[in-house]
Amino acid sequence: MMTGTIETTGNISAEKGGSIILQCHLSSTTAQVTQVNWEQQDQLLAICNADLGWHISPSFKDRVAPGPGLGLTLQSLTVNDTGEYFCIYHTYPDGTYTGRIFLEVLESSVAEHGARFQIP
């Protein structure tokens, strides 16, 4: 039975040209995290594997940095980076948990962070 929940940074906004940290946190389970995938819509950005470490998609290497922790840092943001991002936690023995973050990249300097929220 999957008892865990994924807490994410929720709906967030950031300024064009700036950077943002995408963070998810798995709680309420003792399951072991074996791998975390970061995806933008259907595109794989990066994987952090417990045994093998980080692998960043070469096409994003210049703008994506691993961490902090299991999170992902997006740099040199453009308006095209606006959209949904997913953290996919592979765990043993529970299975897969998915968290969603919506990022809006703003032209202006008025970029406010949304509230944290949970996905059961």
Epitope: A50, D51, L52, G53, H55, I56, S59, K61, H90, T96
Partner: antibody, heavy 117, light 107 residues
Framework: DVQLQESGPGMVKPSQSLSLTCTVT?????????WHWIRHFPGNKLEWMGF???????KYNPSLKSRISITHDTSKNHFFLKLNSVTSEDTATYYC??????????WGTGTTVTVSS | DIQMTQSPASLSASVGETVTITCRAS??????LAWYQQKQGKSPQLLVN???TLAEGVSSRFSGSGSGTQFSLKINSLQPEDFGSYYC?????????FGAGTKLELK
């Protein structure tokens, strides 16, 4: 087009070290991907040995960890395998390969290494 | 270690036939499985990654399926260039492991 080519001695004596070079052309080894060594034994078994990432971090097969070292020379776009204390069991065809998310999308042509006195 | 069990070890088939090779993982590897083809005296070539994604330039006669612990590679309408050895490999943890291979021979 990215190409990989292994080079090194075809014969190594038992207890000595095996050293191989992988020359990468058509792609910079610091621009992404991981860079792996894999060997193919005469009985047809394939064994993954380890890799060096574009940033220089390494991961090794635990069965080889005490004997293996993978390094790179980014100025020459080469990466290297060193395997210490070889025995006849290390006789194999050695391949270097490019790794994308830990599967291998480009392979070298392979070089056969025989361990014999 | 995650063990990969491939079957059959060898297979004889004729041009035009359809064949299926299977691979079983000793534990859940989700969809992190690759398939390679190797011809005599040549290096392996990637056919499929992530269980079902066909590598660039690979014929659509090849198809991969499965998830969890059970996977298969299907080759439709066998062509002369398809004969050789096939290997599965999980790309999920350390050590990365290959199956023992399937030798596909012309009947």
């Amino acid at each position: 087009d990215v190409q990989l080519q292994e080079s090194g001695p075809g014969m190594v004596k038992p207890s000595q070290s095996l050293s191989l070079t992988c020359t990468v052309t058509g792609y910079s080894i610091t621009s992404g991907y991981d860079w792996h060594w894999i060997r193919h034994f005469p009985g047809n078994k394939l064994e993954w040995m380890g890799f060096i990432s574009d940033s220089g971090s390494t991961k090794y097969n635990p069965s080889l960890k005490s004997r293996i070292s993978i390094t790179h020379d980014t100025s020459k776009n080469h990466f290297f395998l060193k395997l210490n204390s070889v025995t006849s069991e290390d006789t194999a065809t050695y391949y270097c390969a490019r790794g994308s998310y830990w599967y291998f999308d480009v392979w070298g042509t392979g070089t056969t290494v025989t361990v014999s006195s | 270690d995650i063990q990969m069990t491939q079957s059959p070890a060898s297979l004889s088939a004729s041009v035009g036939e359809t064949v299926t090779i299977t691979c079983r993982a000793s534990e859940n590897i989700y969809s992190y499985l690759a398939w390679y083809q190797q011809k005599q005296g040549k290096s392996p070539q990637l056919l499929v990654n992530n269980a079902k994604t066909l590598a660039e330039g690979v014929s659509s006669r090849f198809s991969g399926s499965g998830s969890g612990t059970q996977f298969s590679l299907k080759i439709n309408s066998l062509q002369p260039e398809d004969f050789g050895s096939y290997y599965c490999q999980h790309h999920y943890g350390n050590p990365l492991m290959f199956g023992a291979g399937t030798k596909l021979e012309l009947k």
